[in-house]
Amino acid sequence: HSFGPGPGLGTPRSPCNARGPCRLFFRVCLKPGVSQEATESLCALGAALSTSVPVYTEHPGESAAALPLPDGLVRVPFRDAWPGTFSLVIETWREQLGEHAGGPAWNLLARVVGRRRLAAGGPWARDVQRTGTWELHFSYRARCEPPAVGAACARLCRSRSAPSRCGPGLRPCTPFPDECEAPSVCRPGCSPEHGYCEEPDECRCLEGWTGPLCTVPVSTSSCLNSRVPGPASTGCLLPGPGPCDGNPCANGGSCSETSGSFECACPRGFYGLRCEVSGVTCADGPCFNGGLCVGGEDPDSAYVCHCPPGFQGSNCEKRVDRCSLQPCQNGGLCLDLGHALRCRCRAGFAGPRCEHDLDDCAGRACANGGTCVEGGGSRRCSCALGFGGRDCRERADPCASRPCAHGGRCYAHFSGLVCACAPGYMGVRCEFAVRPDGADAVPAAPRGLRQADPQRFLHHHHHHHH
């Protein structure tokens, strides 16, 4: 169990800042598994703070190893039955100590949130959570307080009156050999799977179930607007009329009723009617990883951290996987170096984001007088006579492509090629058929196409000459 710098995240740092010794404490918050994991939502299942906290001192130039967690357990009492699925929020807070602290200074070092599934009475579950440059190793479990037992702490047990057997009609409580199931005190018909009771003749429902006997899934309930079915009737009631019902105190504050109203006892670092205001200001240096603190210049104004690219969270404590945004174009490989992103480009591409196509005409010229032609996302060189290859760098045999049509003979020449045409043809490439009577030449049809009617063709051609 430790809190310290994660692997590969640079030189470990002491959690204390420049103002001398500090100590860490932990706030554990439980939220229903179905609730939003947003910071604002209440710790509806319960919250608690660590108590015994060792003091850490800053030793300049010395690396901070993983810090031991405070001794002892953080106990979070939960209301009603244990839901099985829940959100676990663990915040690591720093308290600045000493004469240079300038009064109590609290700020959030790290906050980890995770959805968890856990039955009550099971073994310790181990976990590792990373956030920003910190890593938290911890264990957690859920236990029922006697006389409750079971995965949801919904069954009541009591000690056996005799070592060998339970009373008439009562079964032993598993997995507790020395205890018996308590006599059924719940309302008759209360669902043994989805209901439980703490007082005689009541039937309280586990999460997801409703109705007088907890037999109706929540989605099919006819009660609207947060109302729940009333006991032994079809009417609907507003849940919990007590001022502390639903715990109006935010951030782990504990609620107490005072003459029809409520009062919140706020944990360290928070204040306000509902503990909704953080006592941290910019003076406490709450922004991590190079974040800039905006606002919070006096105790009544909240601060906001503007995070450098690559970090997020209310205190810039969370590292963003910037490569997940796929910033590298054209199939480039993304590397997040922490201080910057790098793209390793595929062959033929360049630029900070591989955005430059070296195969386009802007990237490279064609040699030996060739001209660049773009098309279909690539480029090719149209080479001058006597040259060939990808960049027109190779000397070419101009006659290799058989450029002379209709049986003309090709002769290589210093300036290119010369075609000696077969009888009846003329033109630079012997492309024109010559009429015997000396009329206009007719371009020969490309191979594979039907020859056009020469009379009609010539008629139009002559028309243009008038």
Epitope: N17, A18, A283, C293, P308, P309, P327, H339
Partner: antibody
Framework: QVQLQESGPGLVKPSETLSLTCTVS????????WSWIRQPPGKGLEWIGY???????NYNPSLKSRVTMSVDTSKNQFSLKLSSVTAADTAVYFC????????????WGQGTMVTFSS | EIVLTQSPGTLSLSPGERATLSCRAS???????LAWYQQKPGQAPRLLIY???SRATGIPDRFSGSGSGTEFTLTISRLEPEDFAVYYC?????????FGQGTRLEIK
């Protein structure tokens, strides 16, 4: 290498609005915060504000009521508008890039001198 | 806002000597959030040091930064002719971002 180039008028009449543009080369404007800083003749540096491509801005409170910044990602440019200018706004105006490990200025433009006079 | 006060206003030294420039903050700054710049006439400032003690890319190792809390120092171990310029400190932990008024380092 990354380059920043300021552009805009060198002379602006008092009470008018100054408009400057900074063109960014060889890096995507979406990857960093971008800032404006000014320096009156013979004096020190004054931070004006910064902007991120997402639209996040932060302005110096002393200038906030007169400053507007914007980003054009398609042109890889960001701009500054300073309204109701006076002779006291005469300065060299620099655009700069904020580093990715904190809000220090790691790349600067060469600056453009703007004088406010009728 | 955090006010940064630099001292001395002007420092006259010879090449080869050691220069020590001071920057004092009106409130505590996390040591991660202080930078130093060098500016020569007619040029833009150049980042030398960030995070109070980390050298920026391409900065010679004769430049070093130190300090924490409210007291920060820039040291140039052996002055070269090209080091004579104006030096500014800047804090970037708390908005508004602020600069010191500068220290002019001149040839004696």
């Amino acid at each position: 290498q990354v380059q920043l180039q300021e552009s805009g008028p060198g002379l602006v009449k008092p009470s008018e609005t100054l408009s400057l543009t900074c063109t960014v080369s060889n890096v995507s404007i979406s990857s960093y915060y971008w800032s404006w800083i000014r320096q009156p003749p013979g004096k020190g540096l004054e931070w004006i504000g910064y902007i991120y491509y997402s639209g996040t801005t932060n302005y110096n409170p002393s200038l906030k009521s007169r400053v507007t910044m914007s980003v054009d990602t398609s042109k890889n440019q960001f701009s500054l508008k300073l309204s109701s200018v006076t002779a006291a706004d005469t300065a060299v105006y620099f655009c700069a890039r904020l580093s990715n490990w904190g809000f220090a200025f790691d790349i600067w433009g060469q600056g453009t001198m703007v004088t406010f006079s009728s | 806002e955090i006010v940064l006060t630099q001292s001395p206003g002007t420092l006259s030294l010879s090449p080869g000597e050691r220069a020590t420039l001071s920057c004092r903050a009106s409130q505590t700054i996390s040591s991660s959030y202080l930078a130093w710049y060098q500016q020569k006439p007619g040029q833009a400032p150049r980042l030398l040091i960030y995070g109070a003690s980390s050298r920026a890319t391409g900065i010679p190792d004769r430049f070093s930064g130190s300090g924490s809390g409210t007291e920060f120092t820039l040291t140039i171990s052996r002055l070269e002719p090209e080091d004579f310029a104006v030096y500014y400190c800047q804090q970037y932990g708390w908005s508004p971002i602020t600069f010191g008024q500068g220290t002019r380092l001149e040839i004696k």
